[in-house]
């Protein structure tokens, strides 16, 4: 929620998701102030006693920072003056999920907004023709997912068709024992058709497309994070 009115400023956050083991961004913007020294940014997390991060008088102030975030956070200091209070989070962990508050004080007033942060693993799928198979077969692979996703195949020609009977999906635990590799095989594919392998959990949805003709193979893939709504 944004707060506006007398002695208050509008603060906007966007619900987002973090990919474990990678950098994450917690997005927050506010009405800018002309003087950097007048801006205070505080990031808080529900259930955590110390601060996630504090930036004031033009620099990081980490004396109240909670131990679990020590050395893992930074704001984009050169962008604070234009109203960017977003936080960079290092090495996202499953335990980083939760409700965060972006609290801003400027010479114009103060305001805050909450942000729901989900954590998991998601990756782009790659669809290939499996030449080792005895029949015309497609293989869809994505290296890292968590929690376990669902996999659904679709085709441009047979729209609405259910491919569950002619596909086989397996989940192989990766070496760190958290994320899993997703492998799905689709049998009895036909030429001159576009097939889509859709992988989805409650954090992200990814699609890998492959178009197979007699003369060429075209691939495309994309990934979208779910529930990215502004507050």
């Amino acid at each position: 929620f944004g707060i506006s009115g007398r002695h208050s400023i509008t603060v906007t956050t966007v619900a987002s998701a973090g990919n474990i083991g990678e950098d994450g961004i917690l997005s927050c913007t506010f009405e800018p102030d002309i003087k950097l020294s007048d801006i205070v940014i505080q990031w808080l997390k529900e259930g955590v006693i110390g601060l996630v991060h504090e930036f004031k008088e033009g620099k990081d102030e980490l004396s109240e920072q909670d131990e679990m975030f020590r050395g893992r956070t930074a704001v984009f200091a050169d962008q604070v003056i234009v109203g960017n209070a977003s936080l960079r989070l290092k090495n996202v962990q499953l335990t980083d999920a939760g409700t965060y508050k972006c609290y801003i004080i400027t010479s114009k007033g103060k305001g805050n907004a909450n942000l729901e942060y989900k954590t998991g693993a998601f990756s782009m799928p790659e669809v290939n023709v499996d030449y080792n198979a005895s029949s015309e077969t497609l293989r869809c692979e994505a290296p890292r997912w968590f929690p376990q996703p669902t996999v659904v195949w679709a085709s441009q020609v047979d729209q609405g068709a259910n491919f569950s009977e002619v596909s086989n999906t397996s989940f192989e635990l990766n070496s760190e024992n958290v994320t899993m590799k997703v492998v799905s095989v689709l049998y009895n594919v036909t030429i001159n058709n576009t097939y889509s392998c859709m992988i989805e959990n409650d954090i992200a949805k990814a699609t890998g497309d492959i178009k197979v003709t007699e003369s060429e193979i075209k691939r495309r893939s994309h990934l979208q994070l779910l529930n990215s709504k502004a507050s």
Partner: antibody
Framework: EVQLVQSGAEVKKPGASVKVSCKAS????????IGWVRQAPGQGLEWIGD????????NYNEKFKGRATLTRDTSTSTAYLELSSLRSEDTAVYYC??????????????WGQGTLVTVSS | DIQMTQSPSSLSASVGDRVTITCKAS??????VAWYQQKPGKAPKLLIY???TLQPGVPSRFSGSGSGRDYTLTISSLQPEDFATYYC?????????FGQGTKVEIK
């Protein structure tokens, strides 16, 4: 331009202590972690620990806990490594390095020239 | 603590060769692996960080890749100035750790 200038070579006797300094310039000293790494003759790099000058927070390699002390003087933008109870195996070049990413502990992107510490009776 | 096992410890190659050095983390997984080049008597120089991001000013013949516990530094076409020792660094966790190093020598 980021610069880290370290103190000169030291010769110490076993059991003594040594304090190596690292003077930073070209950036806001209190906003970036400073790490310490050593390299024994003909050997690889070994991480000792790091310090956040803005608050004095430290992390140490278990191997050096209790013997290494990292401090800083924000008025002179200088970081210090003190190593006590020296033994011959501590003979090495000691490097300080700035960690990229400001308060976020990143990789070491700028290095001092190194300080040779020789421990010999 | 996480250990980084680097291989090979040394290799001989010629100018123009493609060279690959690997590092394996003992546990965990994250993208926080950096690669350094060190020449005798000099401080290490950062080449690559966050698995594959090239440090500004570093030639594009250097590249990094990897995921999970396995990481790779590749020099696509070895140049005379590339003969040096290379180290990986894991910096994702509270305690940082270097690999043992790989010395790249002239064949």
């Amino acid at each position: 331009e980021v610069q880290l200038v370290q103190s000169g070579a030291e010769v110490k006797k076993p059991g003594a202590s040594v304090k190596v300094s690292c003077k930073a310039s070209g950036y806001t000293f209190t906003s970036y972690w400073i790490g310490w790494v050593r390299q024994a003759p003909g050997q690889g790099l070994e991480w000792i620990g790091d310090i956040y000058p803005g608050g004095g927070y430290t992390n140490y390699n278990e191997k050096f806990k209790g013997r290494a002390t990292l401090t800083r003087d924000t008025s002179t933008s200088t970081a210090y490594l003190e190593l006590s109870s020296l033994r011959s195996e501590d003979t090495a070049v000691y490097y300080c390095a700035r960690l990229d990413g400001s308060s976020y502990r990143g990789a070491m992107d700028s290095w001092g020239q190194g300080t040779l510490v020789t421990v010999s009776s | 603590d996480i250990q980084m096992t680097q291989s090979p410890s040394s290799l001989s190659a010629s100018v123009g060769d493609r060279v690959t050095i690997t590092c394996k983390a003992s546990q965990g997984f994250n993208k926080y692996v950096a690669w350094y080049q060190q020449k005798p008597g000099k401080a290490p120089k950062l080449l690559i960080y966050y698995t594959s991001t090239l440090q500004p000013g570093v030639p594009s013949r250097f590249s990094g890749s990897g995921s999970g516990r396995d990481y790779t530094l590749t020099i696509s076409s070895l140049q005379p100035e590339d003969f040096a020792t290379y180290y990986c660094l894991q910096y994702g966790n509270l305690l940082y750790a270097f690999g043992q190093g790989t010395k790249v020598e002239i064949k």
